[in-house]
């Protein structure tokens, strides 16, 4: 039987500063149950980025479909990056409980920001 | 197309155990959550159960007395269902789940049910 | 638990008339309702998701609207088929998955 896995297909990501910056992420199942999030960094100081249900993220939008059944993507659109947003993102899964319990991360993507063109 | 096939329903005396089966077809079963789901006669519908991939998820009325249980080699669902009680009676309906967005369950495809029922 | 009340519990409705139903949460469940019908002797059957998303092969007839804690499911011209009972199913915080106890649409 196959595991679930998260694949970020992007290694790296370069995009200039206040362009928007696309996230890949995809799992191969449904389940376990429980969501994904997004976070920049790795350890107890990671800095949330999405979490579909809790918070407010302004900037980041799914790029599927909300209302899309059965969805499997899990990329994200990051607008108006700056050089503050450089770093590496990680697509978590998270198995549900009390509280949700992190099951498998994706390789992450290293997001690295360009000076505007002038 | 999909379909969902109970079928271990019957009459069982208080203390007594059923397990029911859920064949499933027409869908990648193994990516997908399931789920049982019960109708006490003339009530509304009541969720007992849900399993994930080895995650489970019980109603506080049936934990410690039912397993859910998948395999997905056969395609089937299962419950196990011990120390049954009269307020167990009910029409027991395999479901399956469906997500929208990035997490929320509900049930799409369902069975026709199969009736148990706990009387001495 | 989040408790889904449903209102009216019967409606005696005619053919061709519009019918509304109505879904309160004793919290916010966003936007994370479902809508199913079931006839007598049958299965529940998924006609909305998402509050306002009609499974696929639902009439048009059918709608879902609202958010937070008021949903409403209206039928713009029910049709002799519609007879039934309706509930509404909440996902947003789970377990447990709950159900509204239902509203009975029978024939006037």
């Known amino acids: 039987e196959e595991e679930l896995q998260v694949i970020q297909p992007e290694k790296s990501v370069s995009v200039a500063a206040g362009e928007s910056a696309t996230l890949n992420c995809t799992a191969t199942s449904l389940i376990p149950v429980g969501p994904i999030q997004w976070f920049r960094g790795v350890g107890p100081g990671r800095e949330l980025i999405y979490h579909q249900k809790e918070g407010h993220f302004p900037r980041v939008t799914p790029v599927s479909d909300p209302t899309k059944r059965n969805n499997m993507d899990f990329s994200i659109r990051i607008s108006n990056i700056t050089p503050a947003d450089a770093g590496t993102y990680y697509c978590v899964k998270f198995r549900k409980g009390s509280p949700d319990v992190e099951l498998k991360s994706g390789a992450g993507t290293e997001l690295s920001v360009r000076a505007k063109p002038s | 197309e999909v379909q969902l096939v109970e079928s271990g329903g019957g009459v069982v005396q208080p203390g007594g155990s059923l397990r029911l089966s859920c064949a499933a077809s027409g869908f990648s079963f193994s990516i997908y959550a399931m789920s049982w789901v019960r109708q006490a006669p003339g009530k509304g519908l009541e969720w007992v159960s849900t399993i994930g991939a080895d995650d489970t998820y019980y109603a506080d009325s049936v934990k410690g007395r039912f397993t859910i249980s998948r395999d997905n080699s056969k395609n089937t669902l299962y419950l196990q269902m011990n120390s049954l009680r009269a307020e167990d009676t009910a029409v027991y309906y395999c479901?399956?789940?469906?997500?929208?967005?990035?997490?929320?369950?509900?049930?799409?495809?369902w069975g026709q049910g199969t009736l148990v029922t706990v009387s001495s | 638990e989040i408790v889904l009340t449903q209102s009216p519990a019967t409606l005696s409705v005619s053919p061709g008339e519009r019918v509304t139903f109505s879904c309160r949460a004793s919290?916010?469940?966003?936007?994370?309702i479902a809508w199913y019908q079931q006839k007598p002797g049958q299965a529940p059957r998924l006609l909305i998701y998402?509050?306002?998303s009609r499974d696929t092969g639902i009439p048009d007839r059918f709608s879902g609207s609202g958010s937070g804690t008021d949903f409403t499911l209206t039928i713009s011209s029910l049709q002799s088929e519609d007879f039934g009972v309706y509930y509404c199913q909440q996902y947003y915080d789970w377990p447990p998955f709950t159900f509204g106890g239902g509203t009975k649409v029978e024939i006037k």
């Open positions: 919290q916010n469940v966003r936007s994370d």
């Open positions: 998402a509050a306002s």
């Open positions: 479901a399956k789940d469906s997500t929208v967005g990035w997490s929320g369950d509900f049930f799409d495809y």
